[in-house]
Structure formats: C-alpha cells, structure tokens
C-alpha cells in the first residue's frame, strides 16, 4: 500500500496565494495529486511531478478558507490523502471617499477604512484636466481625515488615496470634486489718522486669502509711496511713514494661490504737524528752575531744552529729555542772572517748532548777624539770620581758642535759627564759624568770638578742733557766689554711708559731731551756683584716740604699787605707762595689751613720789595722756 | 523639477560599512518616499529599501534586513542608506530614487559606486 | 518577499516590430506594477506605473496591461532609441518593491 505525503503544511499565505510545503513518503510512486475546494464548493485537481515537494496555489480570493488534499499515485493505486487547511489573507479595503468644505482653496477629504493597523494613507491630489499637477501627502495610518489647502480657485481635482497595512498598499480610492469660487473682500476703513500714519482695517471671509496688497499713492502727485504685502489672516495694518496735512488713497487688494481680488479703495488725509505748547518755568530757586510744557499725546522720541544766559549767548547748554516727559528740572544755574530756555520736540525725526520762556534765577541765599548770648561758665547760645527755604542744615564749628587743634562741630536743621552751645570750660576764649548747606551750595563762613565766664572762687578747706568725737570744717568762698554748699563726710574704710550736709551760700564752716573716735575721715565741699556744681574740695582727717580714765594707785609697797584706769570706748591696740620720781630722773616706761585695765610697777625707791602717765595707742596714733602720782612706803 | 545628487564614490574593505547620502532640491523632500536600489556590474536592478521622510521609518528588503540603515535629515533634504559588514558581492552602483504615487521610482540620483575589496 | 519573473531574459528584433515583454508575480499585486528601461551606464527611467499608466514624457509607443500576476510591456513599433535593458518592479510593497530580472532588447 502506497503511504501517505508527509507534513503537509502551508508556509505563506498572502491575498490571492497559498504557498504548501511536503515531505516524500518512503514508498515508490509515480506522481502526486493535489486538490483543493473553492469557495463555490467545487474541487480543482492539479498533478504534479514525483519530486515535488512545495506548490503555490495560485488565484485564489482573499480572505476565504480552502481544504487542501495531496495523494501519491502509483498506477491506479493511490495513498490516503494528506490534509490541511488554510485561509488567504483578507485585502484590507477602502471605502467611501468623501470629498467636504471644497472651500474656494482648499479641500477637506474623509475616508473609512477597516480596522487593520494601518502605516500610512497616501493621497495624490491632482488637477482633472492636468494630470501633471499632482500633489503627494503620506498621512499617519490612525487619521480618516486629511485637510489639502492651497489649491486653485474654482478648478476640478481628481483626488485618490490608498493605504499602507503590512508593508503593502490597499487598492486605490478616487473622487472628484471642484474648489469654490473666490470670495470678495468686505469694506474698507481707516482709523487712527495722525500727522505721519494711520491704521487701515478692512474686512473679508476668514482663510480665503493668503495675502493682502495694500498700495498707498499720495493724491496730488499720483505717486505710489509704500507697496505693502501682508498676511492673509490680517484685518488691519498700520501706515507709518506718511507727510503731514497730505492726501491719500488707499487701494487694497485680497491675494490668493493664483487670484487677486478687485481692489477696494479709501481716501484719508492726514493730520497737521505736532506741535508744542504752555511752555512755563515754575519754582525758580537761586540756582535752578523747572520747565513745564505741554503737548499732544504723540510718541515724541525726545525733546531738547536749551538754557543760555540771556547777556552771554555763548554760555549755553542743551539738555534732552526722553520723550515721555512733559517738566524738567535745570540745575546748575547762576544766582540773580538773567536766562532764556528754549525747548523744541523730536517726534519721527522730525523737529517742532522751538517755544522760549525768559525768566531771572533767585538770589544766592545768606547767612548773617551771628550772635552770643546767655554767656554762663559752662555755655552760651548763639543765633544768626538766613534766607529762608533755601537751607538743608547749617554747621557750627566751635575752637577753643587754647587748643586750637581741638574742634566741635555740631550739624542743625536748616529751620533753626538759634543754638545752645554747653559742655564748655569756665573761662575759656572761643572762636565759633557758622556755614549754610543748600543742596548745591555752602555758604561762605561767618564768625564770631565768645568766652565763658569764670566759675566763682571756692578754696582753703581746713579742719581744726579735732577731737575724738569729731571736728571743725571751714573754707573760703567768693562772697554771693553761691546758693548752697554740699559738704560730705565719708569714713577712709568706706564702711559707713556718708554723710551729706547741705548749707546755705553764706556759710564757711561746719562742726562734725558723733563721728568716730580714732578713725580716718574725708571731707568734700563743693558749691552750687546757677545749677552748676564746682569741683569739690578734698580734706583727709582721723578723730583723736579717746584717752583712758580715772587713774587708781593702790598695793604701794617700798619698791611697787598697781595702777588702774577705766579703757577709752573704742578699742586700741595697747597702753603705755609712763612713771617718774617728781624730783627728776630717768622716765621708766611700760606697756601692756589694749585688753588690760591694770598692771604693776616694779623697781621703786622707797618713799619716793612718783608722776605715772597713761596713753592709749592705736598703730602710730596716741591718745592724750592721762596722769596721777602716788609715794611709795 | 526635482533633483537627487548623491555623494562621490567609495572604496571599502570587507568587514567595514559606507554610508552614502542624497540631497533632494525642487520639491516637497519630507511628504515622498526615498527608495534605494543597487546594480552590481552586469547585474539587474535589486531594491534595498526606502524611507518616507515626514515619519523617519524605514522598510527593507528581507535580503538586507539587519545590514541595511535608512535615514533621513528633513532640516537638510537628505536620505543616507549605510550598508554594514561589506563583503565584495556588495560591489555595485547604488541608486537614490523618489516614488510617485503608485509607487513608480520617477526621479533617480546619478548612482554612487562602492567598491568592496581588500 | 513577492518575486517578480520577467521572461524573454533577452530578446531579438528589428527597428518597427511589435515587442512585448511579460513579467509575473509570485502572488497577486492586483495592478500595483512599473515598467522601466535602461541603458549601459545609465540611471533607470520610468516608463510605465500603475501597470498601465504612461509617465509624462514617454513616447505613446509603449503601453502596459496586466493585473494580479500577469503583466505585459508592449512597444508597438521598435525604434533605434529603444534598445535597452527592460525591468519589471512590483510596488504592492510599500514604499516600492522587488524587480524582475530584466529583459534585454537587442538589435536582429
């Protein structure tokens, strides 16, 4: 039995074609015979040589499913057949090709077409009677709609489109169709006439024209100023450029691919010259004024200001200001001088007339008739006269004239007339300048000479009287010198408060009572007059020790006795015990701590009368003595 | 009328690659397609691949896929094709040449001869 | 890849005879298909497109028929200036597409 063709299997498939792939089976035959059902249901037969192993069905419909039978042959024997079952691939199609808005240039196109993932849509775009003209655009494969514009007026197109699907192109689709005819212009005006431009505007159907042709002629002479081509989407253009107080006319024409329109046309006439005016010169200073003027609200480019001493016209200077201003100020100037200021504006390079004002500067501000006054130890106040408004501030250097090198300035408001000078020593010759600061000025200097008064005589601080409790404070004063005197008393170890005593002027001295026997004081005097307080006087002073008591003799014996005494109140250091015969002879001396109130002498002559002195000692400081005698046994 | 001038001839070794360009004047470069075409000596016409400039994407003969490179530079007009891994049955005149609608190749560069030899 | 068999490969005739060269395809190109001549040293020129249609310039002399797999190229009379190598090229393939192998037109 003949065997069966192996692996039979389709390898390609396209549109129309099916490509089959066999293997030869192992037993001998003399041919093969390949049948296949159409879609009509009827079988085709074709024979094929032995060696045959691949065949291309060929013609076939796209998109339809065909059954595929292969037998060997050998004689009337045949194997059983080998099957297999393929379909073509569908043609991706087309369909409805609708040509939209034949607007008068352009050409909207729409078109279906299945769901295949296509590359691209090509489309030739071609006039009917000139196939010449034709026009390629590849379109990305996800659009339906393609818009052609710049096409010509009025004129039949043939318009075909195919698709690109799997590498491969769809059949061509075609239409043909007419662009409309030229649509007219609206009407046109002019706005915004100057002296030297103006503003078209005209109207028209949106997208019809590419350009605009706009020719200006001036009037009188017919002669063609300006030849203007502009952009179809505009509806208006400005006309820079022009002459003044001159006629025009207007023509404008719309422009497509291929066409122009018929032209509209305006007539204008242009506005007068610009000019200046209300030239006015206000706050006129000393050294300085303000120009004022006025003109229309055109862009002036710059405006140029002339300023010359009206006796000196070489002495002249310009000034140009930007063109958005209507006042300048001019510094700079002489003070009480005559002057001439001219101003003309410069507007599309063109210059208006020249305007001139005549106006006299101020005179130069001044500072006079500087005065001292209210002359005390410490200060005195000055005053002057100013021209008024005219002062940022005024400078007062102050010299003493002792030390020159050393100054004071002090800076006022330039209101101020009036100053008060303090913190000045008594006695004491000064040289004081004034200046005036205006903004573009300082004054010539002015000066004068003041002196401060002498500070009243307060002198010879002397203490007396000293005693342990306290002392006497006395001094010297200038008679009706002053108000009242501070005397103060502070103990040299700062350990107590002072004490403060105030007296009236005409007092000299001071008795201190209830201070502290044995210690060191100061004192201070100073005097008040006028609210001032002089420099105090300084005095160092200790109250005395305070001396012991009440002197006893008792246990006298030939060549001994025992002295006592009461201590003094305030603590000392020790007490010393001088003892003598009365008829002469060398003092004996002892000496005991501050804490003992008695001691013994020893080493007396018997019957003798002997003179005993006590002291109390505190450092370098002795008590007054205290004395007694007694006679020895 | 359109143009295509293409760049001088080139001799190369086995193993390299050349780039060749094609500069279009006269017409819209970036909305038609640029196919290039080889003839080696005493040869028919065989196509390479092309390119549609407005999208920059390429299609290539299944004989050239992976070897061949089709580019284009809108800003210049210009196409290149760069061929790699040259062997010596690449000798040949290589055509630039625009299609028309249907696909036709109606405008055709000079031809630029790469030689391929050791 | 669609391939393309032109047949004759060469073809010998005199000044006004009537030529046709055939071309076919390996499947259905419905009638996406070119014709071009050729001669020694020399670029391709367009002749036919779309299998049928004349390219602005060449003479009327030529004519294309044909659609699905089996195209002709007819010169209606032979003239001096047509004696050229003659190619075939499918453009079902998109951007265009394979050749034939060319037919060869030479003088008797």
């Known amino acids: 039995e003949l065997d069966t063709p192996k692996d039979l299997q389709v390898s390609e498939t396209a549109e129309t074609s099916l490509t089959l792939l066999w293997k030869t089976p192992l037993a001998k035959f003399d041919r093969y015979r390949l049948n296949y059902s159409l879609p009509t249901g009827q079988w085709v037969g074709v024979q094929l040589p032995r060696n045959t192993t691949s065949y291309v069905l060929r013609g076939l419909e796209p998109g339809q499913e065909y059954n595929v039978l292969l037998t060997a042959e050998k004689g009337r024997h045949k194997s059983k057949p080998a099957r297999v079952k393929a379909s073509t691939e569908e043609v991706p199609s087309l369909e409805n090709l609708t040509v939209t808005e034949a607007g008068w240039d352009g050409l909207r196109l729409n078109w279906t077409a299945d769901d295949l993932a296509y590359e691209y849509f090509v489309i030739q775009v071609q006039e009917a009677n000139n196939v010449e003209t034709a026009h390629n655009f590849t379109v990305p494969g996800n659009l339906r709609a393609a818009d052609i514009p710049g096409l010509k007026v009025a004129t039949s197109y043939r318009v075909s489109i195919y698709g690109v699907a799997r590498g491969y192109r769809t059949p061509v689709l075609s239409a043909e169709t007419s662009t409309g005819t030229t649509p007219n212009l609206g009407e046109v005006t002019v706005a915004e006439v100057g002296w030297d431009a103006l503003t078209l505007n005209w109207t028209a159907p949106e997208g019809a024209y590419k350009n605009f042709f706009i020719q200006v002629l001036e009037a009188d002479t017919t002669q063609t100023v300006q030849n203007l081509t502009v952009p179809g989407g505009l509806r208006s253009v400005d006309l820079p450029g022009l002459k003044a107080a001159t006629r025009y006319y207007i023509t404008l024409r719309g422009v497509t691919q291929d066409f122009g329109t018929a032209p509209l046309s305006v007539e204008v006439l242009t506005e007068d010259l610009p000019q200046l005016g209300g030239l006015s010169v206000t706050e006129v200073s000393w050294d300085g004024l303000t120009l004022n003027w006025t003109t229309d609200d055109l862009a002036y480019k710059h405006f140029v200001v002339q300023v010359q001493e009206a006796n000196n016209v070489e002495a002249a200077q310009n000034l140009t200001v930007p063109g958005s201003l209507r006042a300048v100020d001019i510094p700079g100037l002489k003070a009480d001088t005559p002057y001439r200021v001219s101003i003309y504006g410069v507007i599309q390079g063109y210059r208006t007339p020249m305007l001139s004002t005549d106006v006299s500067t101020a005179r130069e501000p001044e500072i006079g008739n500087l005065n001292v006054s209210d002359v005390t130890p410490k200060s005195f106040n000055l005053s002057w006269t100013a021209t008024d408004g005219i002062f940022d501030m005024f400078t007062i250097e102050i010299i003493d004239s002792n030390r020159l090198l050393q100054t004071a300035e002090h800076n006022i408001s330039g209101a101020e007339r009036t100053a008060h000078i303090s913190g000045l020593p008594p006695s004491t010759d000064f040289i004081v300048y004034l200046s005036g600061i205006a903004p573009s000025i300082r004054t010539k200097t002015i000066s004068t000479t003041a002196t401060t008064e002498a500070l009243p005589l307060l002198e010879n601080l002397t203490i007396s009287d000293t005693n342990p409790y306290g002392f006497t404070v006395s001094w010297t004063a200038s008679e009706n010198a002053f108000d009242s005197f501070l005397v103060t008393v502070v103990d040299s170890g700062k350990l107590l408060d002072p004490q403060e005593f105030t007296l009236s002027g005409t007092q000299r001295k001071l008795e201190l009572r209830g201070l502290i026997t044995g210690i060191g004081y100061e004192v201070l005097v100073s005097g008040f007059t006028q609210g001032h307080q002089t420099k105090p006087l300084r005095a160092e002073t200790i109250t005395a020790m305070g001396s012991p008591k009440e002197v006893i003799f008792s246990d006298i014996t030939e060549n001994s006795a025992t002295v006592s005494w009461r201590a003094p109140t305030a603590q000392v250091e020790s007490f010393r015990i001088t003892y003598v015969p009365i008829t002469g002879g060398t003092p004996s001396m002892v000496t005991v701590d501050g804490t003992k109130t008695q001691t013994r002498l020893v080493k007396l002559i018997p019957g003798v009368e002997y003179l005993v002195s006590i002291i109390a000692m505190k450092g370098f400081e002795e008590s007054e003595p205290v004395s007694g005698s007694f006679t020895t046994a | 009328q359109v143009q295509l001038v293409q760049s001088g001839a080139e001799v190369k070794k086995p193993g390299s690659s050349v780039k060749v360009s094609c500069k279009a004047s006269?017409?819209?470069?970036?909305?038609?397609?640029i196919s290039w075409v080889r003839q080696a000596p005493g040869q028919g016409l065989e196509w390479m691949g092309g390119i549609i400039p407005i999208f920059g994407t390429a299609n290539y003969a299944q004989k050239f896929q992976g070897r061949v490179t089709i580019t284009a530079d809108k800003s210049t007009s210009t196409a290149y094709m760069e061929l790699s891994s040259l062997r010596s049955e690449d000798t040949a005149v290589y055509y630039c040449a625009k299609g028309n609608f249907y696909g036709g190749l109606d405008y055709w560069g000079q031809g630029t001869t790469v030689t391929v030899s050791s | 890849d669609i391939q393309m068999t032109q047949s004759p490969s060469t073809l010998s005739a005199s000044v006004g005879d009537r030529v046709t060269i055939t071309c076919r395809a390996s499947q259905s190109i419905s009638s996406w298909l070119a014709w071009y001549q050729q001669k020694p040293g020399k670029a391709p020129k367009l002749l036919i497109y779309d299998a049928s249609s004349l390219e602005s310039g060449v003479p009327s002399r030529f004519s294309g028929s044909g659609s699905g797999t089996e195209f002709t190229l007819t010169i209606s009379s032979l003239q001096p200036d047509d004696f050229a190598t003659y190619y075939c090229?499918?453009?079902?393939?998109?951007?265009?597409?394979?050749f034939g192998q060319g037919t060869k037109v030479e003088i008797k």
């Open positions: 090229q499918q453009n079902k393939k998109f951007p265009s597409g394979t």
């Open positions: 006269g017409g819209t470069f970036s909305s038609y397609a």
